[in-house]
Interface confidence: low
Amino acid sequence: AGYVFRDKVMSEFNNNFRQQMENYPKNNHTASILDRMQADFKCCGAANYTDWEKIPSMSKNRVPDSCCINVTVGCGINFNEKAIHKEGCVEKIGGWLRKNV
């Protein structure tokens, strides 16, 4: 039962994270939550950083600044792959959730 519950938590988290990405950065509250997660967990996007390319409000060569290894204003523009966290947040935060939920 515990595994089923954890899988459900992961699935819900994945869906919710992707939904919040769609609202970035139009919704300031959403943006600050996602930015905090990405910066704290050193991750970028849901599955990986390329997820941001699919978001209408983000240009093809941009990720949120919170994806950067060294976060500064504008660091996510025309980014260098070596300078950002490439791992997705669902897996990374999911691992933390599995241990703690």
Epitope: K26, P56, S59, V73, G74, C75, I77, N80
Partner: antibody, heavy 119, light 112 residues
Framework: EVQLQQSGPELVKPGASVKMSCKAS????????MHWVRQTPGQGLEWIGY????????KYNEKFKGKATLTSDKSSSTAYMELSSLTSEDSAVYYC????????????WGQGTSVTVSA | NIMVTQSPSSLAVSAGEKVTMSCKSS????????????LAWYQQKPGQSPKLLIY???TRVSGVPDRFTGSGSGTDFTLTISRVQAEDLAVYYC????????FGSGTKLEIK
């Protein structure tokens, strides 16, 4: 209010180079892409390239590679474009255009710099 | 490069009339993964710089009067001005930003 103030008109001789400036105000200079676009009666509007002032990353239209060089100075919030080996075909109005990265149509246009190439 | 073709090249209408202008791209500018058309419309009044009116093919920029409407998807787009006013005298350009950046040659709107 976003403003892009471009340098004045230039009259230059064929074969010479020219460097024009675009001073930005009213927004965080490093968080926008700065495009350069030229307008001629014959060719209409043509995208030259853009620079991301945060990291000085550039992207050029193939047609203008070797012709245009884009740079920026973060300390003065100013973007520059240098054009080399000028010919009469380079006579045009050149615009700098700030592109808000939330959608990347071209949002804020400078007033334009007129360049006339004549012997 | 994606080519952008506008028609007509010019048109003259009386104030209060409805006007439509067309923009066609040589290939689709619809990004299927999020159903957005990478197409914008600009207005350039005589002696002025171009001004962004519409992006994502149909989203009006804040402050642009609602008589300006962008529509279309894929390769065929239209800018409609529902009740033309004297101040709308300008050249209107469409612009694709799906693959690099290219502009149409413009439609000149004159007021009779």
């Amino acid at each position: 209010e976003v403003q892009l103030q471009q340098s004045g008109p230039e009259l230059v001789k064929p074969g010479a180079s020219v460097k024009m400036s675009c001073k930005a105000s009213g927004y965080t200079f490093t968080s926008y892409v700065m495009h350069w676009v030229r307008q001629t009666p014959g060719q209409g509007l043509e995208w030259i390239g853009y620079i991301t002032p945060y990291n000085d990353g550039t992207k050029y239209n193939e047609k203008f590679k070797g012709k245009a060089t884009l740079t920026s100075d973060k300390s003065s919030s100013t973007a520059y474009m240098e054009l080399s080996s000028l010919t009469s075909e380079d006579s045009a109005v050149y615009y700098c255009v700030g592109g808000d990265n939330y959608y990347y149509a071209m949002d804020y246009w400078g007033q334009g710099t007129s360049v006339t190439v004549s012997a | 490069n994606i080519m952008v073709t506008q028609s007509p090249s010019s048109l003259a209408v009386s104030a209060g009339e409805k006007v439509t202008m067309s923009c066609k791209s040589s290939q689709s500018v619809l990004y299927s993964s999020h159903q957005k058309n990478y197409l914008a419309w600009y207005q350039q009044k005589p002696g002025q710089s171009p001004k962004l009116l519409i992006y994502w093919a149909s989203t009006r920029v804040s402050g642009v009067p609602d008589r300006f409407t962008g529509s279309g998807s894929g390769t065929d787009f239209t800018l409609t001005i529902s009740r033309v006013q004297a101040e709308d005298l300008a050249v209107y350009y469409c612009h694709q930003y799906f693959s690099s950046f290219t502009f149409g040659s413009g439609t000149k709107l004159e007021i009779k």
